[in-house]
């Protein structure tokens, strides 16, 4: 009866999902079979977020707006470690939009989930952020310092990183 | 004031190449991105180019991307716009005008009077 | 590309009257609150010269007889009383998203 119930349940909040994500990869979390965690596929999973990389092409708003019908937004990074995930899956030769912005010009960078912009867990290029005029943040590749950030116009398409909470049911 | 001044335009073969030039004064042009904006005759504007302050970040919409190049001397106060491999529907007056962003937009707030590239044989 | 198309393409207004030119785009042009759609009045002759930004505010040193309304993809120029020196090309465009795209003009002119 118990396990009939959590059965029920997993399915009730699976169909919410499936509106934006038909389909869910999931896996067993630690020893107990009641836990499992989940993330769209194909996105890839680390710690407790989902990832999706974006290929199409947007403006940074449009590229927000894109996460947001998938029930995410633009990446937040949040320490080296993370950042190290996510470089594994990009490609060396594209610029990919990150949650992150200054809307007003004033180095006031602020991300999309208002998550506290900490000076001390940035990976800007050297001589990055250099313009007032350039308000987004990517990451890209560059030969001499590996993977890092840089401003550039919002407007400009770019390819994009979608963050989600894992789903558990 | 702000001035923008552009030159350069003429009368060119199919397959030419141009150069074109915008002086400003009244500006601090250093910190300032900078576009190019084209009107043929009789249609709507179409945007043509634009480079940031310091010079590293350009952008082009298809329709020029590899034939046109924007750039830059701060230290003469100038913009300038080569055009390569001139097709007749590259035929307008060209404009450059300074950039102001808004939030995550834009507006192109100060225009030059122009000048005419015409591509014919 | 977002496509802007104004209506109508022109305009006979008599002076002092009100002039309402409008500006559909092919997707949305909105963002937190803000929308990134521009007007510029051309002159035969001139360059464009900037009206209004972000839809509804009035760039310095125009008079406030320009307005501009509008959300998501329907925006409006309004002209409160039209006069003599208003007779131009008028022309929407919206920088959300590179390429930046014009609207075909709408040229107004005097009954």
């Known amino acids: 009866n118990f396990m009939y119930s959590k059965t029920v349940k997993r399915l009730s909040k699976l169909r919410e999902y499936q509106q934006y994500h038909p389909s869910l990869t999931c896996v067993m979390e630690g020893k107990d079979i009641e836990d499992w965690s989940c993330c769209p596929t194909p996105w890839t999973s680390f710690q407790s977020s989902c990832y999706f990389i974006s290929t199409g092409m947007q403006s940074w708003t449009k590229s927000q707006k894109n996460c947001s019908v998938m029930g995410a937004d633009l990446v937040v990074i949040n320490t080296r470690e993370e950042q190290d995930f996510i470089i594994q899956n990009l490609k060396r030769n594209s610029s990919y939009f990150l949650g992150l912005s200054d809307p007003g010009g004033r180095r006031h960078w602020q991300w999309v989930d208002q998550t506290p912009y900490n000076e001390n867990v940035t990976f800007w290029h050297s001589g990055e952020p250099n313009n007032l005029d350039e308000r987004c943040a990517i990451i890209n590749f560059r030969s001499s310092e590996e993977w890092g950030w840089n401003d550039i116009h919002c407007h400009v398409p770019q390819k994009s990183i979608c963050k989600m909470k894992k789903i558990y049911i | 004031e702000v001035q923008l001044l552009e030159s350069g335009g003429g009368l060119v073969q199919p397959g030419g190449s141009l150069r074109l030039s915008c002086a400003a004064s009244?500006?601090?042009?250093?910190?300032?991105?900078m576009s190019w904006v084209r009107q043929a005759p009789g249609k709507r504007l179409e945007w043509v180019a634009t480079?940031?302050?310091?010079?590293?970040?350009?952008y082009y919409p298809d329709s020029v991307k590899g034939r046109f190049t924007i750039s830059r001397d701060n230290s003469k106060n100038t913009l300038y716009l080569q055009m390569n491999s001139l097709r007749a529907e590259d035929t307008a007056v060209y404009y450059c005008?300074?950039?102001?962003?808004?939030?995550?937009?834009?507006?192109?707030?100060?225009w030059g009077q122009g000048t005419t590239v015409t591509v014919s044989s | 590309d977002i496509v802007l198309t104004q209506s109508p393409d022109s305009l006979a207004v008599s002076l002092g009257e009100r002039a309402t030119i409008n500006c559909k785009a092919s997707?949305?042009?909105?963002?937190?609150?803000?929308?990134?759609v521009n007007w510029y009045q051309q002159k035969p002759g001139q360059p464009p010269k900037l009206l209004i930004y972000?839809?509804?505010n009035l760039e310095s040193g125009i008079p406030d007889r320009f307005s501009g309304s509008g959300s998501g993809t329907d925006f409006t120029l309004t002209i409160s009383s039209l006069q003599a020196e208003d007779v131009a090309v008028y022309y929407c465009?919206?920088?959300?998203?590179?390429?930046?795209?014009f609207g075909g003009g709408t040229k107004v002119e005097i009954k």
């Open positions: 997707q949305s042009v909105d963002y937190d609150g803000n929308s990134y």
């Open positions: 005008a300074t950039y102001r962003p808004y939030y995550y937009g834009s507006v192109l707030d100060y």
């Open positions: 009244g500006i601090t042009f250093s910190t300032y991105t």
């Open positions: 972000g839809a509804s």
């Open positions: 480079i940031n302050s310091g010079g590293d970040n350009t």
């Open positions: 465009q919206q920088s959300d998203e590179d390429p930046w795209t």
